[in-house]
Amino acid sequence: SYQVICRDEKTQMIYQQHQSWLRPVLRSNRVEYCWCNSGRAQCHSVPVKSCSEPRCFNGGTCQQALYFSDFVCQCPEGFAGKCCEIDTRATCYEDQGISYRGTWSTAESGAECTNWNSSALAQKPYSGRRPDAIRLGLGNHNYCRNPDRDSKPWCYVFKAGKYSSEFCSTPACSEGNSDCYFGNGSAYRGTHSLTESGASCLPWNSMILIGKVYTAQNPSAQALGLGKHNYCRNPDGDAKPWCHVLKNRRLTWEYCDVPSCSTCGLRQYSQPQFRIKGGLFADIASHPWQAAIFAKHRRSPGERFLCGGILISSCWILSAAHCFQERFPPHHLTVILGRTYRVVPGEEEQKFEVEKYIVHKEFDDDTYDNDIALLQLKSDSSRCAQESSVVRTVCLPPADLQLPDWTECELSGYGKHEALSPFYSERLKEAHVRLYPSSRCTSQHLLNRTVTDNMLCAGDTRSGGPQANLHDACQGDSGGPLVCLNDGRMTLVGIISWGLGCGQKDVPGVYTKVTNYLDWIRDNMRP
């Protein structure tokens, strides 16, 4: 039967008709009393006093209503829920996830989890209505939990007309024996204790740290992972795990050398809605590693679009060497990540200046052999690009990656729709092409142009008449990615390099073969 419920927009909690609740007012000491009336929450301020007994976890401040028994918790940053029991920064689960209190709410099938307080779950063995719900992590939310000591966090989802349990796709903190961090590392509980400069971390309980905020003496030390150890942590929501160090007898802090757990090659792909000559209009969230490189020219004012690029780590962009033949000074270059429209700023875009760029020293500007370049983004810290749904690294391929001939892959870029067009595309495009066998990627197939072992070919193999809209890269796409699915992740196979025209039948595009440059990439990205 259809039920009227209210959803509190501030907390995303759900309430039944006529149910009442208290909620804190953000950035103030006020508390509001709300009740659910015909699907709308009606709220007004009420007087409160400090709670007579502690009821809030993780350093939350408890206040109870003056004239009735309900209470509310003012949660410190990073925590939420009725009793501040939800850790909004937990990006992965440990062991089986019994203690996981994060906010992942997607099942393995991609379905959204159901709120544990939903009346549809009232008869289920595990719901937010249980007397021990808080202890089990259940409540007025739809986050994945493992209340029954199963193998990993799960939730109820509505499918095939009924509610059934399904495991969640929550990342596990330690995959194999990797010691790495997710997100900004506030949930990192590993044992790295060296900084990026190689200095040893000071123990968090060291006497030298007296007077510092983040030490083993902090009231929330346990929740923050601080204690009688010198392991890297991120207690203050910084960019990544860090620790206190002594440098030249001076107390300071440094970021740690903990590797980030890779989320490379993962994305929220949405089916393109619009066909366009040479490909399909796309959203940046489908190609979050796509970069747009702009250059200031000595002769003309302002910046103009130069080439595509590929985000391969927080501070490094891969591109094509031929894009930099004008030898721009690095400060004349700008890199934009997270942009769908070529010249229209995106809501979540990230813009960077370039610290330096490295063009392969054996790049041949006649044949485009070794057509590869690296750009280092400028940043005040050791991190540059912040991961989001529209900005994410692509995976570099394993050295021995050999995909079958005719594997379907995709490229993206802001390049022209066709060779004779005077303009670049106003919007990001994607194109679907297949990898050609090396026997079909030779000089004789490309008008006697030199084709080396550092190149690979890919093209649209559909048969088409003169009006066929064959997918291909085109001018302006150079430096962008050719990616293929490998082990469930989009993996960089080629860098858009050159071609004869665009979208011609039986004429593939030519790409820099990335597997030939893995050692070169590693070598040049060294700290």
């Epitope: 010691d179 790295h192 060296l194 990026e196 400069s197 190689g198 050398d257 903990v258 590797p259 330096k356 490295i358 020293k361 690296l374 280092q376 570099l396 391929p397 394993p398 050295a399 021995d400 597997t515 893995l518 050692d519 590693r522 070598d523 040049n524 990205m525 060294r526 700290p527």
Partner: antibody, heavy 114, light 112 residues
Framework: QVQLVQSGAEVKKPGASVKVSCKAS??????INWIRQATGQGLEWMGR????????GYAQKFQGRVTMTRDTSISTAYMELSSLRSEDTAVYYC?????????WGQGTLVTVSS | DVVMTQSPLSLPVTPGEPASISCRSS???????????LDWYLQKPGQSPQLLIY???NRASGVPDRFSGSGSGTDFTLKISRVEAEDVGVYYC?????????FGGGTKVEIK
């Protein structure tokens, strides 16, 4: 911290191959390098392997004779040297590179003798 | 290949006195990414080598501040301000800028 533990000493005949292993614990972010040292001699760099992607770079002197591989599931790197000759008798070290070769294995003595 | 030449070959020292080792490369060892990967390693008798100085002048973790590195281009120096008995061993300079990476021939530091 990174710890590197190498396999035990080997005695091989000329023309044979030897495969030395190096098990890593901790963050081996960049490369595992292989360096050798003949008795009473200096250090000689042989090559490197990226433990993640498996890409390699070898010294020209060993090209065609050396193969560096890794098994990520057990965090182990391997160095195989083929067509052994008496002058390959040496202690073979693995060393992990981050900003330099900050961590070294204990060394593996390979003796080539008929 | 880049040849790294160290001098002296042998260095007898008195505890408490300073010591200096020179290392010269046959060509510039500035990497294409702008860094100079010149390191110093110490191999104590019967042990694996250990890192002392990386990228010309940065002291590795746990290395006493009596060790310092300097230089640029092709000329580099390792200095020990006051030698201690535990500093004996063979010191190697090393370039990691151009493949093949190469070590100097080594300088043996011993107590007089």
């Amino acid at each position: 911290q990174v710890q590197l533990v190498q396999s035990g000493a080997e005695v091989k005949k000329p023309g044979a191959s030897v495969k030395v292993s190096c098990k890593a614990s901790g963050n081996t972010s960049y490369w595992i390098n292989w360096i050798r040292q003949a008795t009473g001699q200096g250090l000689e760099w042989m090559g490197r392997i990226d433990p993640g992607g498996g890409s390699t770079g070898y010294a020209q002197k060993f090209q065609g004779r050396v193969t560096m591989t890794r098994d990520t599931s057990i965090s182990t790197a391997y160095m195989e040297l083929s067509s052994l000759r008496s002058e390959d008798t040496a202690v073979y070290y693995c060393a992990s590179y981050y900003y330099a070769m900050a961590y070294w294995g204990q060394g593996t003595l390979v003796t080539v003798s008929s | 290949d880049v040849v790294m030449t160290q001098s002296p070959l042998s260095l007898p020292v008195t505890p408490g006195e300073p010591a200096s080792i020179s290392c010269r490369s046959s060509q510039s060892i500035v990497h294409s990414n702008g860094n100079t990967y010149l390191d110093w390693y110490l191999q104590k008798p019967g042990q694996s080598p250990q890192l002392l100085i990386y990228k010309v002048s940065n002291r590795a973790s746990g290395v006493p501040d009596r060790f310092s590195g300097s230089g640029s281009g092709t000329d580099f120096t390792l200095k020990i301000s006051r030698v201690e008995a535990e500093d004996v061993g063979v010191y190697y300079c090393f370039q990691g800028s151009h493949v093949p990476w190469t070590f100097g021939g080594g300088t043996k530091v011993e107590i007089k």
